[in-house]
C-alpha cells in the first residue's frame, strides 16, 4: 500500500496473508466463510500457508493469530494467465477458523459499486514503488471507486465488467504484495486487489480490483459444492 497508514488493530479481522516458506508474504486474501478465503486467481501456488489474526508482517508470534494450510484452491474457470479478467480464487482451509475479535469473516457485497463510493483497501504489500519496502504492520488506505469510463480511459481495451478501478490522489495505491486483499465498502467486501500500472501510484493510473458483485453466485455455489 503506497501512502497508506497503519490500520487500527482488530479492524480487519478478515484480512489474511498468504505465505511461502520461510514466512514470505506474496499475496493477501480475505476470509469470507469459516473455512474459505477469497484471493486473486493470479495468487495461485502449489504450496502455501495462511495466516489470520496477525497485525505485523514479521513472523513474531501474536496471541490472536491462527495458522492454516490451504487444502484446495479453486480459481474462477474464466481466469486465464496472464489476463486479468475473472481474477478471483477460493481457498479452502484445512479446518474452520475459531471466531475471535481478530479472526472473523466478511460478507461479499451483492451490489455493484457506484462511482464515488468510499472504500478501504488493506495489505502488507510494498510501501514504495518501483523500490521495494515492506511495512512493519498492516496498512490501510481510503480509496474512491471511479466510473467505468474513467477506468477504461486509464487502461484502454483492458477493462471489463469483472473489474473496477479505485484510487485517490496520485501517490496513493495498492501495490506488489497486496494482491488478493480486501476492498471494503460500506461494511462489505466489494473487491480484491488485482492489478494496476507499474510503478504503482502513478497519476491517472488507478488500481484495478476484481468486481466481486459479479461473482456472488459462483462463490456461494463453489463453497457449497466443496464443503
Amino acid at each position: 500500500i503506497i501512502n497508506g497508514s497503519d490500520c487500527d488493530m482488530h479492524t480487519q479481522p478478515w484480512q489474511a496473508a498468504l505465505l511461502l516458506r520461510p514466512n514470505q508474504l506474496y499475496c493477501g486474501a480475505v476470509l469470507v466463510h469459516p473455512q474459505w478465503l477469497l484471493t486473486a486467481a493470479h495468487c495461485r501456488k502449489k504450496v502455501f500457508r495462511v495466516r489470520l489474526g496477525h497485525y505485523s508482517l514479521s513472523p513474531v508470534y501474536e496471541s490472536g493469530q491462527q495458522m492454516f494450510q490451504g487444502v484446495k484452491s479453486i480459481p474462477h474457470p474464466g481466469y486465464s494467465h496472464p489476463g486479468h479478467s475473472n481474477d478471483l480464487m477460493l481457498i479452502k482451509l484445512n479446518r474452520r477458523i475459531r471466531p475471535t475479535k481478530d479472526v472473523r469473516p466478511i460478507n461479499v457485497s451483492s451490489h455493484c459499486p457506484s462511482a464515488g463510493t468510499k472504500c478501504l483497501v488493506s495489505g502488507w504489500g510494498t510501501t514504495k514503488s518501483p523500490q521495494v519496502h515492506f511495512p512493519k504492520v498492516l496498512q490501510c488506505l481510503n480509496i474512491s471507486v471511479l466510473s467505468q469510463k474513467r477506468c477504461e480511459d486509464a487502461y484502454p481495451r483492458q477493462i471489463d465488467d469483472t473489474m473496477f478501478c479505485a484510487g485517490d490522489k496520485a501517490g496513493r495505491d495498492s501495490c506488489q504484495g497486496d494482491s488478493g486483499g480486501p476492498v471494503v465498502c460500506n461494511g462489505s467486501l466489494q473487491g480484491l486487489v488485482s492489478w494496476g500500472d507499474y510503478p504503482c501510484a502513478r497519476p491517472n493510473r488507478p488500481g484495478v480490483y476484481t468486481n466481486l458483485c459479479k461473482f456472488t453466485k459462483w462463490i456461494q455455489e463453489t463453497i457449497q459444492a466443496n464443503s
Epitope: 514470505q24 506474496y26 495468487c43 489476463g83 486479468h84 510494498t126 518501483p130 504484495g177 494482491s179
Partner: antibody, heavy 126, light 107 residues
C-alpha cells in the same frame, strides 16, 4: 510455438548507431515485460534494459544509460533497442528475453526470464 | 546495485556425480533468485525460479534452495547434457544482476 527472433546486429564503428529488433510470436506479447541481455565474447551474461508491458516503466544498466533506448510496439509484437554512441565494450551477442514476472499484477512474486531469442551479434570496431 | 557472486567459477565432474553451485547476494533478496543453464552458442534457459521452483520441463535432478543472501543449485546426478555454464540472477531489484557463471566441465 512461443518464439523470439532478434535482428539488426552487425559491424559498426565506434560512435556509430544500431537498432536491434525482436519479433515475438506464439504468445500475447502485450501482456509481458521484456528485457535485453547481452554477452560479450567469452564473458558472462549482462542485463541491459527492461520495459514493462505498457512501456510505463523502463530501466537500464548504468553501462548503457543515456546511450541506449528500449521501446516496444505491442500492435506489431515487437521490441526494439536503439543503440547510439557505441563503444568497443558494447561488442556482444544481444538477446531479447521475456520476463515471466507481471509487474502489473500486484502479487509479490518474481520469476525470471523464461523465453529467450537466439541472439544477434553486435561488433563495434574500427 | 546488488552484486551476485557465484562459486566455483568452474567445476570438473563425471556423469552421475552430484554437483553443487552456490550464489551469494550482496544484500538480502528473499527467495527471488533464478538459475539459468547456457550451452555454447545457445541462449540461456530458465531452470529454477523463486530459488527452488522448477521451471516446466526441467528434469527433477535439478533443485534449488536458499533464501536471503545464500543460494544453492544442485544437480543430483550429472547427465551428459548437463555440461554447460550456469548463472544465477537476482530478480526483485533493478538493475537486474547475474552471477559470473559456473562452468560444469567433463572430468
Amino acid at each position: 510455438e512461443v518464439q523470439l527472433v532478434e535482428s539488426g546486429g552487425g559491424l559498426v564503428q565506434p560512435g556509430g548507431s544500431l537498432r536491434l529488433s525482436c519479433a515475438a510470436s506464439g504468445f500475447t506479447f502485450g501482456s509481458y515485460a521484456m528485457n535485453w541481455v547481452r554477452q560479450a565474447p567469452g564473458k558472462g551474461l549482462e542485463w541491459v534494459s527492461y520495459i514493462s508491458s505498457s512501456s510505463s516503466f523502463i530501466d537500464y544498466a548504468d553501462s548503457v544509460k543515456g546511450r541506449f533506448t528500449i521501446s516496444r510496439d505491442n500492435a506489431k509484437n515487437s521490441l526494439y533497442l536503439q543503440m547510439n554512441s557505441l563503444r568497443a565494450e558494447d561488442t556482444a551477442v544481444y538477446y531479447c528475453a521475456r520476463d515471466l514476472t507481471s509487474m502489473q499484477s500486484r502479487d509479490y512474486y518474481y520469476y525470471g526470464m523464461d523465453v529467450w531469442g537466439q541472439g544477434t551479434t553486435v561488433t563495434v570496431s574500427s | 546495485d546488488i552484486q551476485m557472486t557465484q562459486s566455483p567459477s568452474s567445476v570438473s565432474a563425471s556423469v552421475g556425480d552430484r554437483v553443487t553451485i552456490t550464489c551469494r547476494a550482496s544484500q538480502g533478496i528473499s527467495s527471488w533468485l533464478a538459475w539459468y543453464q547456457q550451452k555454447p552458442g545457445k541462449a540461456p534457459k530458465l531452470l529454477i525460479y523463486a530459488a527452488s521452483s522448477l521451471q516446466s520441463g526441467v528434469p527433477s535432478r535439478f533443485s534449488g534452495s536458499g533464501s536471503g543472501t545464500d543460494f544453492t543449485l544442485t544437480i543430483s546426478s550429472l547427465q551428459p547434457e548437463d555440461f554447460a555454464t550456469y548463472y544465477c540472477q537476482q530478480v526483485p531489484i533493478f538493475p537486474y544482476t547475474f552471477g559470473g557463471g559456473t562452468k560444469v566441465e567433463i572430468k
